[in-house]
């Protein structure tokens, strides 16, 4: 569960979990900064414009990110 | 299984601190943030703090903030909830509560500890 | 601040039905999901409800929530009402000035 109300890292938890890119608002992955020295993967859900952290760790995870930006790759002209 | 254990407490008096620990098991307690939630004597369940999987981000009820402080140890599985200042309105059963990495909510508890604040 | 407002009790007979509001106020109820916990007497609050309507594995689907916009509010419906559902149900939400905010919880007794 994110919280946006900070300027440290946003993430409360974290998970292996991929989500279903239908369900994607958009995936935003924030480097590691002065704020937060680790990278965080944040999940905007269509449904209630709900967050999620993603463990960029997980082998799950990365493939969601694979698939995300081939999915995205062929999109672009 | 995924189980949560409060100990530490017990009869404190005013004015004086405390510390409850709550050790965690049986599920990726490194990936996830860890609530407390207490009960006073017949009312109902108020939030009190969390931290995050990491420690960085710790939030707080106004009730407790500047007295309460939550930290934890992930090496040791465990998180704790050091009280200072404690007034009577502290006495209550006190839980620890998984997060919800999917969202907003408290997936699993623990047992509770009650504390006590009298003189 | 956002509030969570639920009655103090209510009391239905073995096999009835009978529905939890819970009403927010300072806010949209709609725009965080509401989660449903149950505590029996003296035990630790298990998950019945989260995400509005969705069901943790191993809870009946006798239990059901719902959101209504209109009124601002939330219920947790349990239907075929059993001796063993008799205790207090709390609403749960998340505000960003309040964090994580309950319900006070409502004692549900079968007759």
């Known amino acids: 569960v994110p919280l946006s109300r900070t300027v440290r890292c946003t993430c409360i938890s974290i998970s292996n979990q991929p989500v279903n890119p239908r369900s994607l608002e958009k995936l935003e992955i924030i480097p590691a900064s002065q704020f937060c020295p680790r990278v965080e993967i944040i999940a905007t859900m269509k449904k209630k414009g709900e967050k999620r952290c993603l463990n960029p760790e997980s082998k799950a995870i990365k493939n969601l990110l694979k698939a995300v930006s081939k999915e995205r790759s062929k999109r672009s002209p | 299984q995924v189980q949560l254990v409060e100990s530490g407490g017990g009869v404190v008096q005013p004015g004086r601190s405390h510390t409850l620990s709550c050790a965690a098991s049986g599920f990726a307690f490194k990936n996830s943030g860890i609530h407390w939630v207490r009960q006073a004597p017949g009312k109902g369940l108020e939030w009190v703090a969390v931290?995050?999987?990491?420690?960085?981000?710790?939030f707080y009820a106004d009730s407790v903030k500047g007295r309460f402080t939550i930290s934890r140890d992930n090496s040791q599985n465990t998180v704790y909830l050091q009280m200072t200042d404690l007034r009577p309105d502290d006495t209550a059963v006190y839980y620890c509560a998984r997060d919800g990495s999917e969202s907003e909510y408290l997936d699993y508890w623990g047992k509770g500890t009650l504390v006590t604040v009298s003189s | 601040n956002f509030m969570l407002t639920q009655p103090h009790s209510v009391s239905e007979s073995p096999g009835k039905t009978v529905t939890i509001s819970c009403t927010g106020s300072g806010g949209s109820i709609d725009r965080n999901y509401v989660q449903w916990y149950q505590q029996r007497p003296g035990s630790a609050p298990i998950t019945v409800i989260y995400e509005d309507n969705q069901r943790p594995s191993g809870v009946p689907d006798r239990f059901s929530g719902s959101i209504d916009s209109s009124s601002n509010s939330a219920s947790l419906t349990i239907s075929g009402l059993r001796t063993d559902d008799e205790a207090d149900y709390y609403c749960?939400?998340?505000?960003?000035?309040?964090?994580?905010?309950f319900g006070g919880g409502t004692k549900v007794t079968v007759l």
């Open positions: 931290i995050s999987y990491d420690g960085s981000n710790k």
């Open positions: 749960q939400s998340y505000d960003s000035i309040n964090l994580w905010v």
